[in-house]
Interface confidence: low
């Protein structure tokens, strides 16, 4: 019988224990400062900074800034101690500076829309550049009170790092105020203005009669014609044209916080809700060995997929880079980079009936816009912290 510890799978001095109960056949006991199923990535050093209510401590994207918390279950604030905001209009009202609140309905349950005075034009009637916002822009943590177009959505912190998702959309149309408010605004129904958040689309959602079926058949490798519509998520890409190798097609790398005990369900939920929301086929990509392209974050492979640079002080053996890791980690929540394939074959000028983002950059802007107006988080199984689009490349030539 082969000893699973024979290959010394544990890195950074971790000790290996063979166990039939683990998906890998072994468990690594990691030294302080390292984590993951093979101890292959560093645990972020949070010091005295503690993330409550299951929040995940992540290194700041800005060198020299303290670690930040990715909060779960609607909690917020630097330590995840701020309780979840009530659904809909409260009380207390989510609209600041005397803004009036009206309730909306959507995929994620009751939402809200604020009607704001001109002096405070953020989605929650925030005042960009308000007192206390100096120095908080671009620190990796979304400060809702500092988020608005005037302050580039807290320097991109509230819009997935995109300073202005509506760049190119005429400012006088104020489409960022009207985006995804449940009403069609024809002046915003364009690529530049992000199709008014699809508020002009009919039908707006997959019909209840098809929804359960399409849910259960989503990206199962078989084209279900009844589910191959924009509102039903294009069957998770199962009906995409056969020409071209999907391995080299466009993709999105998403940095999300998920709970490993139910990771597969959450990955499924993430792919399907984003397919329905973006009206493009999305699925978790598999690598050449047939494994989900899901990588623990922080970690070299994850950072590579996000387009970041490697920390030169970070030592890692070659083996872990060849395999997705982290699906067996036992913490309550963890950061993962999920690489999703994207079927854009039904989008673009050749398909005027299917208004959807026809390149990954536009997808990023659309997601950033949703994040900016607070429409994204209620839909997802965990916080989405960053998105990195890949346009797709031609496969390398066979070398004989």
């Amino acid at each position: 019988e082969i000893d699973p510890c024979h290959s010394q799978p544990c890195f950074h001095g971790g000790t290996c224990e063979a166990t039939a109960g683990s998906p890998l056949g072994f468990i690594c006991h990691c030294p302080k400062g390292f984590e993951g199923p093979t101890c292959s990535h560093r645990a972020p050093s949070c010091g005295f900074h503690h993330c409550h209510h299951g929040g995940l401590c992540l290194p700041s994207p800005k060198p020299g800034f303290p670690p930040r918390c990715a909060c779960l279950s609607g909690y917020g604030g630097p330590d995840c101690l701020t309780p979840p905001a009530p659904k809909g209009c409260g009380p207390p009202s989510p609209c600041l500076y005397n803004g009036s609140c009206s309730e909306t309905t959507g995929l994620g349950g009751p939402g809200f829309r604020c009607s704001c005075p001109h002096s405070s034009p953020g989605p929650r009637c925030q005042k960009p550049g308000a007192k206390g916002c100096e120095g908080r822009s671009g620190d990796g943590a979304c400060d809702a009170g500092c988020s608005g177009p005037g302050g580039n959505w807290d320097g991109g912190d509230c819009s997935l790092g995109v300073p202005d998702p509506w760049k190119g959309c005429p400012s006088h149309s104020r489409c960022w105020l009207l985006f995804r408010d449940g009403q069609c605004h024809p002046q915003c129904d364009s690529e530049e203005c992000l199709f008014d958040g699809y508020d002009c689309e009919t039908p707006p959602a997959c019909t209840p009669a098809y929804d359960q079926y399409c849910h259960d058949h989503f990206h199962n490798g078989h084209c279900e014609k009844g589910c191959n519509t924009a509102e039903c998520g294009w069957d998770g890409g199962d009906c995409r044209p056969e020409d071209g190798d999907p391995e080299w097609g466009p993709s999105l790398a998403l940095l999300v916080v998920l709970s490993p005990p139910a990771l597969d369900q959450q990955l499924f939920a993430l792919a399907r809700v984003l397919s329905l929301t973006l009206r493009v086929g999305l699925w978790v990509r598999k690598d050449r060995d047939g494994r989900d392209m899901v990588y623990p974050y922080p970690g070299a492979r994850a950072e590579e997929k996000l387009g970041g640079t490697r920390d030169p002080t970070y030592q890692e053996r070659a083996a872990p880079q060849t395999q997705p890791l982290g699906k067996e980690t036992d913490s309550l929540s963890a950061g993962f980079v999920v690489v999703m394939g994207v079927d854009l074959s039904r989008c673009g000028p050749d398909h005027p009936a299917s208004r959807c983002p026809w390149d990954p950059g536009l997808l990023l802007r659309f997601l950033a816009a949703m994040a900016a107006v607070g429409a994204l988080e209620p839909l997802l199984p965990g916080p989405l912290l960053a998105v990195h689009p890949h346009a797709g490349t031609a496969p390398p030539a066979n070398q004989l």
Epitope: A209, Y210, Q212, Y213, D216, N220, G226, A262, D264, Q265
Partner: antibody
Framework: EVQLVESGGGLVQPGGSLRLSCAAS????????MSWVRQAPGKGLELVST????????YYANSVKGRFTISRDNSKNTLYLQMGSLRAEDMAVYYC????????WGQGTLVTVSS | DIQMTQSPSSLSASVGDRVTITCKAS??????VAWYQQKPGKVPKLLIY???TRHTGVPSRFSGSGSGTDFTLTISSLQPEDVATYYC?????????FGQGTKVEIK
């Protein structure tokens, strides 16, 4: 050729337990949702339970909820139904079937509940 | 739960006759409806799915139609081998439910 072969049926007393198995072949088992459907003698068809392709989501008919457990082992291409606290009304032929539009069925296994 | 009500519960027709079985859903199920044939002592066999798509190998005399709440299975020319019980089923939402069955016999 798609094949589904059930086993594990038999005579059991009220309150007893049984575990049904369904061995699948001829298709990529891990890509399909699977279900158990039953048919009481001389009666119609009733969906008992279903499970999605990776085992992450399950559904149970109200009549069996809390007593039956559906599971699958994709490495063995096998679907299971663990039945507990069996009642007289659970007596039926149990079929395993592939997917919601049940294109493929096993031959069925008879579960008899009697004292 | 969505109820699927079939009618008639049984019928007797001559060889060559056109036979129609209807199924009424208690609420809108789109076209997420399948029809099955079960011969005495045999396993159910899928005939139609998505309300009107014939399954592989099913003779062309079987056809399905309908959407929303009203569905029909038609056998254009009844054959002796069509003697069976026919069931409709909705798979629009859990729990997927079957009709009570329609028994077809030859006069």
């Amino acid at each position: 050729e798609v094949q589904l072969v059930e086993s594990g049926g038999g005579l059991v007393q009220p309150g007893g337990s049984l575990r049904l198995s369904c061995a699948a072949s001829g298709f990529t088992f891990s890509s399909y949702g699977m279900s158990w459907v039953r048919q009481a003698p001389g009666k119609g068809l009733e969906l008992v339970s279903t499970i999605n392709s990776n085992g992450g989501r399950t559904y149970y008919a109200n009549s069996v909820k809390g007593r039956f457990t559906i599971s699958r082992d994709n490495s063995k291409n096998t679907l299971y139904l663990q039945m507990g606290s069996l009642r007289a009304e659970d007596m039926a032929v149990y079929y395993c079937a592939r997917d919601q539009g049940f294109a493929y069925w096993g031959q069925g296994t008879l579960v008899t509940v009697s004292s | 739960d969505i109820q699927m009500t079939q009618s008639p519960s049984s019928l007797s027709a001559s060889v060559g006759d056109r036979v129609t079985i209807t199924c009424k859903a208690s609420q809108d199920v789109g076209t997420a409806v399948a029809w099955y044939q079960q011969k005495p002592g045999k396993v159910p066999k899928l005939l139609i799915y998505w309300a009107s798509t014939r399954h592989t190998g099913v003779p062309s005399r079987f056809s399905g139609s309908g959407s929303g709440t009203d569905f029909t299975l038609t056998i254009s020319s009844l054959q002796p081998e069509d003697v069976a019980t026919y069931y409709c089923q909705q798979y629009s939402s859990y729990p997927w439910t079957f009709g009570q069955g329609t028994k077809v016999e030859i006069k």
